[in-house]
Structure formats: structure tokens, C-alpha cells
């Protein structure tokens, strides 16, 4: 049996200043259990830009329907874009554990930020 | 339809062991993390175990005990229970594993049961 | 590990009357609820998750609603297939999955 991808299809995305971005990302199977979450960056140092468990993201906003069942697209939307959310964004799979651990990634989107029309 | 058909239930002493099997028909089998509940005669429901592909989980209660596993060429789950005490005594259901959206798993189907009794 | 503690234990009701039950948690599970109904002698079967959506297939006459910690099930116009006992079970954290002690719904 095949093992579960992670699938972001944009390379890049260029968003205008205030705008939104919306950001790609669906998985190719619902197993290993466990939960997805978004990231700008990579390594130890990368920071968490959604959970859908903990935390606040007053910005961030998932593009399927909270209430879809076997939902396999992990797509998010980043509103009010500023260019310091300039980087390379990562949609990671985790396979549910104590703690949870990180089983497969994205091969990340680089979002850039073009100045506002004036 | 979905069907899913437990077997193997059956009495043992304390300390014996059993292998539960189900049997699953009517959707993708491998693509669905399945688990066994069980229900002691008169009380409330109980979750055992759960396994996802490489991935399972255990309640305390079985930890160590029990080894849940599946076979996706024959759509078969299984549950090895091993060291059976009193206590594990219950009508087991094998259930298939449902998400909502960003959520955790529920259980849209359930098999009959097959009752274990552990007795001397 | 999340508790959660169903009200009443037992709820004699009239066919055709309304029946309303609750599924507190002992913390914050958003909306990750599910209810089940297990008629005697039967396997369990999902009615509600989500906190209120509706199983395809199950009659309008059920509707769960609440989040956060404090959930409820209501039955309008109880049929006689609908006395049964009734399980609330949460999926945001675990392992391990846990489910309320039930509520039984019996003719009045």
C-alpha cells in the first residue's frame, strides 16, 4: 500500500500587501492518525503558523469546511498579507503519539509579498 | 454497504488468550484506521485500541496485553489478547474510524460483537 | 484523559414527547463530540457529530448542539424504536477516546 504524501502544488505564491494568501495543501491518505499543522520555515527555530488545536491564529482561516468528513485538503487562507510574512511555508503531517511527532512535510510554498497598488 | 463481522470470541480462563478478528466489506479498507470498543454485560462502552497504518494505540488497561493489527490484503482486523483477566470479560466491537475536517476520529460503523468471557 | 459525565442516568418519557439529555466534559473539547444510540442487544450507531451534525440517515427528530464542555441531545416526539440508551463520546484529545456512562430513555 502507498504511503501517505503530503502534497503542496505551489512552488510559490506572490500576494499584494492587505490581501489574502491562500496556501495548498491535501494529503493523499487519512492514515497515520494524526493531526497537520502549518509552518513558515524549517528546522528547530521554524515558527507555527496553524493547529487546529491549540493556540489563537486570528488570521488564519482552512479553506474545507470544518464539518467535511475524510477531509484530505489541508489548505489554509492567511489574510491581511504584510511582507513580513515573506517565506517558505510548510504543510507538515503528524502521526499521533506522546508526544506527537512529525512524519512527513510538504515540499514547502514560498510566499512573497508585492507592494500595495497604489 | 458497510459490514464489518467480528469472530472469535469465546470463554478462557484467566491468564489464556484469544484472537478477535474482523472481517470488513464495502469500502476502501486500508484507507481507514479501525478500533475495537468493548462493552462489559450491563455497562457503558470502552475504548481498547485503535490502528491506523504502522501507527496503534491502547487503552492502560490493555497495554501490553493486548496487539491490535490488521491485514489490508484480506480486509481483516485483529485483536491478540493475551494474559486475560475478569475484568476483559465484554461483548467486543470492531468500528471503522471517521474524521470531520482538522478533527479527531469518531465511528460511523460498528460490528455486531463477539462476546469473551473469562472465567475459571 | 477527558471525562465526560452524562445527565440524567435514566429519563422516563412518554412516545411522542420531547427528550433533552446532556454530555458534560471535564475540559474544553471544542466541538469533537459524537453521539451514539445502542438499542438492546445491538451495536452502537452514530447519530450525531461534530456536536451537531446529523449521520446520514438518521431522522430530524435528533439534533445535538452545545461546545466547549457542555453538549446536549434532544429527541422531539420520541418513536418507539427511539428507547434505547444514548453514549456521548469525545475525539479531540486522546488516546485515550472517551465515552460518557450513557443515558437510558424508557417509556414512561
Known amino acids: 500500500e502507498e504511503e501517505l504524501q503530503v502534497i503542496q502544488p505551489d512552488k510559490s505564491v506572490s500576494v499584494a500587501a492587505g490581501e489574502s494568501a491562500i496556501l495548498h495543501c491535501t494529503v493523499t491518505s487519512l492514515i497515520p492518525v494524526g493531526p497537520i499543522q502549518w509552518f513558515r520555515g524549517a528546522g528547530p527555530a521554524r515558527e507555527l503558523i496553524y493547529n487546529q488545536k491549540e493556540g489563537h491564529f486570528p488570521r488564519v482561516t482552512t479553506v474545507s469546511e470544518s464539518t467535511k468528513r475524510e477531509n484530505m485538503d489541508f489548505s489554509i487562507s492567511i489574510s491581511n498579507i504584510t511582507p513580513a510574512d515573506a517565506g517558505t511555508y510548510y504543510c507538515v503531517k503528524f502521526r499521533k503519539g506522546s508526544p506527537d511527532t512529525e512524519f512527513k512535510s510538504g515540499a514547502g510554498t514560498e510566499l512573497s509579498v508585492r507592494a500595495k497598488p497604489s | 454497504e458497510v459490514q464489518l463481522l467480528e469472530s472469535g470470541g469465546g470463554v478462557v480462563q484467566p491468564g489464556g488468550s484469544l484472537r478477535l478478528s474482523c472481517a470488513a466489506s464495502?469500502?476502501?479498507?486500508?484507507?481507514?484506521?479501525m478500533t475495537w470498543v468493548r462493552q462489559a454485560p450491563g455497562e457503558g462502552l470502552e475504548w481498547v485500541s485503535t490502528?491506523?497504518?504502522?501507527?496503534?494505540y491502547y487503552a492502560d488497561s490493555v497495554k501490553g496485553r493486548f496487539t491490535i493489527s490488521r491485514d489490508n490484503s484480506k480486509n481483516t482486523l485483529y485483536l491478540q489478547m493475551n494474559s486475560l483477566r475478569a475484568e476483559d470479560t465484554a461483548v467486543y466491537y470492531c468500528?471503522?474510524?471517521?474524521?470531520?475536517?482538522?478533527?479527531?476520529?469518531?465511528?460511523?460503523?460498528w460490528g455486531l460483537g463477539t462476546l469473551v468471557t473469562v472465567s475459571s | 484523559e477527558i471525562v465526560l459525565t452524562q445527565s440524567p442516568a435514566t429519563l422516563s418519557v412518554s412516545p411522542g414527547e420531547r427528550a433533552t439529555f446532556s454530555c458534560r466534559a471535564s475540559?474544553?473539547?471544542?466541538?469533537?463530540l459524537a453521539w451514539y444510540q445502542q438499542r438492546p442487544g445491538q451495536a452502537p450507531r452514530l447519530l450525531i457529530y461534530?456536536?451537531?451534525i446529523r449521520e446520514t440517515g438518521i431522522p430530524e427528530r435528533f439534533s445535538g448542539s452545545g461546545s466547549g464542555t457542555e453538549f446536549t441531545l434532544t429527541i422531539t416526539s420520541l418513536q418507539s424504536e427511539d428507547f434505547a440508551v444514548y453514549y456521548c463520546?469525545?475525539?479531540?484529545?486522546?488516546?485515550?477516546?472517551?465515552f460518557g456512562g450513557g443515558t437510558k430513555v424508557e417509556i414512561k
Open positions: 468500528a471503522k474510524d471517521s474524521t470531520v475536517s482538522w478533527s479527531g476520529d469518531f465511528f460511523d460503523y
Open positions: 464495502g469500502f476502501s479498507f486500508s484507507n481507514f484506521a
Open positions: 490502528i491506523g497504518s504502522g501507527d496503534t
Open positions: 475540559q474544553n473539547v471544542k466541538n469533537d
Open positions: 461534530a456536536a451537531r
Open positions: 463520546q469525545q475525539y479531540y484529545d486522546w488516546p485515550p477516546f472517551t
